[in-house]
């Protein structure tokens, strides 16, 4: 807290300019009017104040706006944004995407801070949904943003926003998140032709059900092993050897290297060894010839 002292003669700030950087903390407190500061916030960011000095300026703004800063001030906070606490940010009403971009720019290249997370939360809640422009902006600054959302939060993403998603944005998503995103992606890309559709839908396939994988197997898509390994195990298990062969195309040879890992391992255990042998890959662990497989889950459903 800076002690309140009278402003020395001739030092009263008439405008926010570079001379203020050489003011001591108490001089900033005494000689800079909070209302002047608020109206010339765009200039503050152009002056490389120390964080100690920014503390004084923040204190002045907090006194002027105890209920939270107006957006005209927020947009020009610059480095002062790094001084804000999540509690400060919860008082704000940020509606402009330009304001959001300006503040994310300050934090660019660093992990998402609690302040940024709070800011984004306030912004998205204010908009009511995660629209395409917002998603575009957020994933540009934080590629992992989408995967930091809960399935419930993801449910507010409109299908049209899915066009903004890049494959790397989904790298850290878990199956529960992909379960929510996949149907939206399917809807978003439904009017594309086969090969183009597959390119777009590929990174969302960790949420695809069996019937969609079966349909893809009829389209000569040549899915790579990395994508196959991210598929839901429960969606892969019902696929026949022939369907997997068609789905993977020339990449089917990669199954051998993955035979001990899920979902390949579990899928092998469900296939007849005879059928596996037709691949000529030496996959072992299938159901021996002559054995009858009873699907007990189906039996229970019927009784």
């Amino acid at each position: 807290e800076v002690e309140k002292t009278a402003c020395p003669s001739g030092k009263k700030a008439r405008e926010i300019d570079e001379s203020l950087i050489f003011y001591k903390k108490w001089e900033l407190e005494a000689c800079v009017d909070a209302a002047l500061l608020a109206t010339q916030m765009d200039r503050v960011n152009a002056i490389p104040f120390t964080y100690e000095q920014l503390d004084v300026l923040k204190h002045k703004l907090d006194e002027l706006y105890p209920q939270g800063y107006p957006e005209s001030v927020i947009q020009h906070l610059g480095y002062l944004f790094l001084k804000m606490s999540p509690e400060d940010i919860r008082k704000w009403n940020v509606t402009s995407l330009e304001t959001l971009k300006a503040l994310l720019e300050v934090n660019k290249g660093h992990e998402m801070s609690p302040q940024v997370a709070t800011l984004i939360d306030r912004f998205v809640k204010g908009r009511g949904q995660l629209d395409k422009d917002t998603l575009d902006t957020l994933t540009a600054f934080y590629p992992g943003y989408l995967c930091s959302l809960s399935p419930e939060e993801l449910s507010s993403v409109p299908p049209s926003s899915i066009w903004a998603v890049r494959p790397q944005d989904l790298d850290t998503c878990d199956p529960r998140q992909l379960d929510v995103l996949y149907p939206k992606a399917r809807l978003a890309f439904q009017n594309m032709n086969g090969s183009e559709y597959f390119v777009k839908i590929q990174s969302f396939l960790g949420g695809a059900p069996t019937e969609d994988l079966k349909a893809l197997s009829q389209q000569n898509v040549s899915m790579d092993l990395a994508t196959f390994m991210k598929l839901r195990t429960d969606a892969v298990l019902p696929l026949t050897v022939a369907e997997v062969q068609k789905l993977l195309g020339p990449h089917v040879e990669g199954l051998k290297a993955e035979e001990r890992h899920r979902p390949v391992r579990d899928w092998i255990l469900r296939q007849r060894q005879d059928d596996l042998d037709t691949l000529g890959l030496g996959l072992q662990g299938g159901i021996p010839n002559g054995y009858l497989v009873l699907d007990l889950s189906m039996q229970e459903a019927l009784s």
């Epitope: 120390t50 964080y51 100690e52």
Partner: nanobody, 116 residues
Framework: EVQLVESGGGLVQAGGSLRLSCVAS????????MYWHRQAPGNERELVAY???????NVADSVKGRFTISRDNSKNTLYLQMNSLRAEDTAVYYC???????????WGQGTLVTVS
């Protein structure tokens, strides 16, 4: 975090020159602006000069025309060239930096300049 070590201080006669250096280490890629401050015995600390990552610099009126600040990013080093030194320039000179990653100023331990 960023660590700062100043050097180059010492005893000099009025009218003489000194060149202070400040070497930064640690997360130097996050450094934005670098500053020289000074604190004379019994006085408050005051900002003497600064230089931004873009090369913009300025010095306080009290040292204008005598002190020059510069920065060598490849060596992570900040300099303060002090000419025409006066008795009132006697102080402990501190280097500090502002980073883009953490909202506190990082400080060196200071180097003493005595002008007789």
């Amino acid at each position: 975090e960023v660590q700062l070590v100043e050097s180059g201080g010492g005893l000099v006669q009025a009218g003489g020159s000194l060149r202070l250096s400040c070497v930064a280490s640690g997360r130097t890629s996050t450094i934005d602006t670098m500053y020289w401050h000074r604190q004379a015995p019994g006085n408050e600390r005051e900002l003497v000069a600064y230089v931004t990552s873009r090369g913009t610099s300025n010095v306080a009126d009290s040292v204008k025309g005598r002190f020059t600040i510069s920065r060598d990013n490849s060596k992570n080093t900040l300099y303060l060239q002090m000419n025409s030194l006066r008795a009132e320039d006697t102080a402990v000179y501190y280097c500090s930096v502002r980073t883009t990653s953490y909202p506190v100023d990082f400080w060196g331990q200071g180097t003493l300049v005595t002008v007789s």
